[in-house]
Interface confidence: low
């Protein structure tokens, strides 16, 4: 534990006076005190030695030498008194805040022990106390009050009697704020209700706190019902419980309920919608389009959103073909409840294989009936291309297929040079087709169509190739005569290369 | 030195919806309440209603229940008043004003007009 | 709610002589739990925010000066400003916060004469 010279308690100078306060530890040690003026500090390894040539009752307060490496935490402490005739008061702190049951000290420092007897709190402009206004003094911190309340907070002044009169220090703002825990906590259940007209409901709506003196009631759109309060207490809470039981429900019963609490903190609500309706019902809907494009090979998501009363009594997935009588796999369905009325399914297809296109229909049954909901897959594929040599109508022709879908585009080029793909710098003619014919086009399945270019004379150091694209990506075929004047030949005497 | 600061002016049409925010700097906004007060060209103050900045809860007038929605946010140390399918009488300066740990309302922001016009 | 009754509307005021604006509430606001009477009393200067004056019925705001006064108990108030001054322009609303609602008066205009 540090040491502090002059080892006694207090120290009493007078305004003006010099002193050294010498703080010597095992270790470094610090001074920590009330922040005023004039003081130096000079450290030196083990020792501290605070000290002012001028010392003024702004210098009154106790300080404290403690050694930060104790692990012991240990400190030592000597109070000074600036008595200054004049100023029989230091204060700290101009305002002053606590909770409501804190003691709030008001830091008022006495610069003169021998006042002690006389000292007093008094309110601003002389005003006395409040009544029940528990408080006592310590010369070396100040008036405390005890346990204080909400209609403390008001401006205070400390009073010391010098000669006869009272002597008063500036005004302390003590603020105590009160501890309310807010408003009741509060439950409504069900969050959302339907029931067929002739059912039984029942809504129940509960409030809690910790303090007994709250109101909780339900009110059917702007009408406060009238239903009698179960009260209770567990968990060290008030719990207040309003049930209102309908036998059997009609539509004025529907519409909007609050539950509403209050205190004197304030007021919080919750509200649930009631829904009364004729019959059953089965709503499916999805967010998504019912005609989908999926590129092979990659996955799909099919979501319906189920909205029912009451609930669901079956459901299922069911592939409609074209292709093949597969099912969609259980595994791959799965089912989730957004709330009590509203459902989510989806069925998951993951790497969509050729035989996999079609319609997928989501099915759905309660009291209410059958509902159905019909997705149309369509697969989108790049074009593949093949080339031939022909004659049609005694013309040399190339004949180009493409097969893909969304329907490709066509476009020829000839260039020169024996290549599998003309590129820009070989390129001598190009043509677009922009209406090839389509061989082809049935629902869920590839569009194929033709494209012909009239050919004279095959030019013998060149190459023909067909180029098709679309949305997926693009496909080619490229076509090399192999000798000049080979348009007098049959096609079967042309090499071709894909 | 403790500021509230709104934003600026709004021109609506009725049936719409205004969102007016008021941040908060100089104190911790958690500690206090925070009011709304709105007057209508030439009229007088009308209080909507108050925000508990650290829990969300709020208390409304009356009158503006089911229209009035105040939240806030406080990582930005702002609260916000919304005011739904506005009506032309709704036209008015809206004011935030905090509330004092003693209750009273220590300071106010500039104010935000909010015209409601076809 | 409670109501807020305000008079006079207007008040015209030589610069140096007294003021009095008169509120009346619908209901007392004094809570008998703590004592406190909840009135407070404001001035909106001309294209300005409202400014408090005083609270809780007879503390002054920081920052307002001595001329003005609040006193009253129960359901009658009055706020005095003992020597008015040109800067004092502007409407004084009365307000009571002892229960929600909060409700103001509807304001009293002061002008210099």
């Known amino acids: 534990i540090p040491v502090i010279e002059p080892s006694v308690p207090e120290l009493v100078v007078k305004p003006g006076a010099t002193v050294t306060l010498r703080c010597v530890g095992n270790g470094s040690v610090e001074w920590d005190g009330p922040p005023s003026p004039h003081w130096t500090l000079y450290s030196d390894g083990s020792s501290s030695i605070l000290s002012t040539n001028n010392a003024t009752f702004q210098n009154t307060g106790t300080y404290r030498c403690t050694e930060p490496g104790d692990p012991l935490g240990g400190s030592a402490a000597i109070h000074l008194y600036v008595k200054d005739p004049a100023r029989p008061w230091n204060v700290l702190a101009q305002e002053v805040v606590v909770f409501e049951d804190q003691d709030a000290l008001l830091p008022c420092l006495l610069t003169d022990p021998v006042l002690e007897a006389g000292v007093s709190l008094v309110r601003v402009r002389g005003r006395p106390l409040m009544r029940h206004t528990n408080y006592s003094f310590s010369p070396w911190h100040g008036f405390t009050i005890h346990r204080a309340k909400f209609i403390q907070s008001q401006d205070y002044q400390c009073s010391a009697l010098m000669g006869g009169r009272k002597v008063m220090s500036i005004s302390i703002r003590l603020k105590v704020q009160k501890v309310i825990p807010g408003p009741p906590a509060l439950t409504l259940v069900p969050a959302e209700l339907v029931r067929i007209r002739g059912e039984a409901a029942q809504i129940v709506c509960s409030a809690s706190s910790v303090d007994v003196n709250f109101d909780v009631f339900l009110q059917h759109n702007n009408t406060k019902l009238a239903i009698p309060q179960q009260s209770d207490f567990h968990n060290n809470r008030y719990q207040k419980v309003l049930t209102l039981n309908l036998d059997q429900v009609d539509f004025q019963h529907a519409g909007n309920y609050s539950c509403v609490a209050s205190n004197v903190q304030g007021k919080h609500s919750t509200s649930m919608f009631f829904r009364v309706v004729e019959s059953a019902y089965l709503n499916l809907s999805s967010e998504q389009n019912l005609i989908q494009e999926v590129t092979v090979g990659e996955g799909l998501n099919l979501k319906v959103m189920v909205e029912a009363y009451p609930g669901l009594q079956g459901f299922n997935w069911t592939y409609l073909g074209p292709f093949s009588d597969h099912q969609p796999e259980p595994k791959l369905a799965n089912a989730t409840t957004k709330d009590t009325y509203r459902h989510t399914f989806t069925l998951s297809l993951p790497r969509l294989k050729p035989s996999e296109a079609g319609r997928y229909s989501f099915l759905a049954r309660n009291p209410g009936g059958w509902r159905a909901l019909t997705f149309e897959l369509t697969l989108r594929y790049p074009p593949e291309v093949s080339v031939i040599w022909t004659f049609i109508n005694g013309s040399g022709t190339l004949l180009c297929a493409a097969s893909g879908y969304p329907q490709p585009n066509v476009t020829w080029l000839q260039c020169s040079g024996h290549t599998d793909r003309c590129d820009e710098a070989q390129v001598l003619q190009v043509w677009d087709d922009p209406y090839p014919e389509v061989l082809s086009q049935e629902p869920f399945h590839k569009v194929t169509v033709q494209s012909l270019l009239t050919v004279e004379t095959l030019e013998h150091n060149q190459t023909y190739e067909c180029r098709a694209h679309n949305s997926v990506g693009s496909g080619s075929w490229a076509f090399i005569p192999i000798s000049a004047g080979a348009h007098t030949h049959p096609p079967d005497e042309f090499l071709f290369t894909p | 030195q403790v500021q509230l600061v709104q934003s600026g002016p709004e021109v609506k049409k009725p049936g719409a919806s205004v969102k007016v925010s008021c941040k908060a700097s100089?104190?911790?906004?958690?500690?206090?309440?925070m009011h709304w007060v709105r007057q209508a060209p030439g009229q007088g103050l009308e209080w909507m209603g108050w925000?508990?900045?650290?829990?969300?809860?709020?208390n409304y007038a009356q009158k503006f229940q089911g229209r009035v929605t105040m939240t806030r946010d406080t990582s930005i140390s702002t609260a916000y008043m919304e005011l739904s399918r506005l009506r032309s009488d709704d036209t008015a300066v809206y004011y935030c004003?905090?509330?004092?740990?003693?209750?009273?309302?220590?300071?106010w922001g500039q104010g935000t007009l909010v015209t409601v016009s076809s | 709610d409670i109501v807020m009754t305000q008079t006079p509307l207007s008040l015209p005021v030589t610069p140096g002589e007294p003021a009095s604006i008169s509120c009346r509430s619908s209901?007392?606001?004094?809570?008998?739990?703590?004592?406190?009477?909840?009135l407070d009393w404001f001035l909106q200067k001309p294209g300005q925010s409202p400014q408090l004056l005083i609270y809780?019925?007879?503390y002054r705001a920081s920052g307002v000066p001595d001329r003005f006064s609040g006193s009253g108990s129960g359901t009658d108030f009055t706020l005095k400003i003992s020597r008015v001054e040109a800067d004092d322009v502007g409407v004084y609303y009365c307000?009571?916060?002892?229960?929600?609602?909060?409700?103001f008066g509807q304001g009293t205009k002061l002008e210099i004469k």
């Open positions: 004003a905090r509330q004092d740990n003693w209750n009273y309302f220590d300071y």
């Open positions: 100089g104190y911790t906004f958690t500690g206090y309440y």
């Open positions: 925000i508990n900045p650290i829990s969300g809860g709020t």
């Open positions: 209901q007392s606001l004094l809570d008998s739990d703590d004592g406190n009477t909840y």
């Open positions: 809780t019925l007879s």
């Open positions: 307000m009571q916060r002892i229960e929600f609602p909060f409700t």
